[in-house]
């Protein structure tokens, strides 16, 4: 392990489409990948009329967008599907939206997902 960096070995897993995809709906996913590459967790969700609908959560392959991010935060302004990634075991349990472009206070609070 590199000092000061959280290694990701497992992530919260969720799949809203679990029946069609023939997977579990929720659980813990061990993260695999090339041994020298970094691993991350991700979360994707939709905001439908102010209601948060989680799409998927799980492991994400080596991505410089996720380096040294301990929190899972989407910064893109008003995406169709929200996506965030982070480093550290189960770091995708909570996720939030803080658009970089906005000058005003973000309207969304950090979300603690409660899968159905």
């Amino acid at each position: 392990a590199i000092l000061g960096r959280s290694e990701t070995q497992e992530c919260l897993f969720f799949n809203a489409n679990w029946e069609k995809d023939r997977t579990n709906q929720t659980g813990v996913e061990p993260c695999y990948g090339d041994k020298d590459k970094r691993r991350h967790c991700f979360a994707t969700w939709k905001n439908i009329s102010g209601s948060i609908e989680i799409v998927k959560q799980g492991c994400w392959l080596d991505d410089i967008n996720c380096y040294d991010r301990t929190d899972c935060v989407e910064k893109k302004d008003s995406p169709e599907v929200y996506f965030c990634c982070c480093e550290g075991n189960m770091c995708n349990e909570k996720f939030s939206y803080f658009p970089e472009m906005e000058v005003t206070q973000p309207t969304s609070n950090p979300v603690t997902p409660k899968p159905p």
């Epitope: 799409v55 392959l61 599907v81 996506f83």
Partner: antibody
């Protein structure tokens, strides 16, 4: 092992569209990006665009903006690249590659645009 | 984002070392460790060799090494072998907020 298998060669008329597929196996498709790159005969590599396979979010090179559409079907672990308004200069081998580091590549698909 | 600059060709004899440069700007190569190197033999798909400036892809011989100084990334191949004769491309990470760009490619001839 990780494999990206692309669809076969295509011959197209100028003005038409082409859709190339890239089927991934050996890893979880929704755990990274798929990038598309092309290479004209005797020329270098040219980045076209990328898709986040889980969110469907895309980014395209300015040169191809408005003419290229990249999609992903998570149920079949397949990414697609559609290029419209084809011209002779679009004759090239089109490659898909996994992840932001392009660590695994498809075998390439030759698209020939000719009248 | 404009293309990265590589020499058109380099050459060396078996056993020698060669270095291929890849020059960008302070806002891409200079500020981020996100340069890749690829090897491409004629008629084949590119093969990933180096990522993050200096990390070797698994299975790549340690004769291949990457480095960076200022706005220029470099690929050094030591102990040249006949099978190293190929085209080499540098390129950047692409995904999320990062847009991809490649160098023009360098033809390596083993004399």
């Amino acid at each position: 092992q990780v494999q990206l298998v692309q669809s076969g060669a295509e011959v197209k008329k100028p003005g038409s569209s082409v859709k190339v597929s890239c089927k991934a196996s050996g890893y979880k498709f929704t755990s990274s990006y798929i990038n598309w790159v092309r290479q004209a005969p005797g020329q270098g590599l040219e980045w076209m665009g990328t898709i986040n396979a889980v969110s469907g979010s895309t980014s395209y090179a300015q040169k191809f903006q408005g003419r290229v559409t990249i999609t992903a079907d998570t149920s079949t672990s397949t990414a697609y690249m559609e290029l419209s308004s084809l011209r002779s200069e679009d004759t090239a081998v089109y490659y898909c590659a996994r992840g932001g580091w392009f660590d695994y590549w498809g075998q390439g698909t030759l698209v020939t645009v000719s009248s | 984002q404009s293309a990265l600059t590589q020499p058109r060709s380099v050459s060396g004899s078996p056993g020698q070392s060669v270095t291929i440069s890849c020059t960008g700007t302070s806002s891409d190569v200079g500020s981020k460790n996100y340069v890749n190197w690829y090897q491409q033999h004629p008629g084949k798909a590119p093969k990933h060799m180096i990522y993050g400036v200096s990390k070797r892809e698994s299975g790549v011989p340690d004769r291949f090494s990457g480095s960076k100084s200022g706005n220029t990334a470099s690929l050094t191949i030591s102990g040249l072998q006949a099978e190293d004769e190929a085209d080499y491309y540098c390129g950047t990470f692409a995904g999320g907020k990062y847009y991809g760009v490649f160098g023009g490619g360098t033809k390596l001839t083993v004399l």
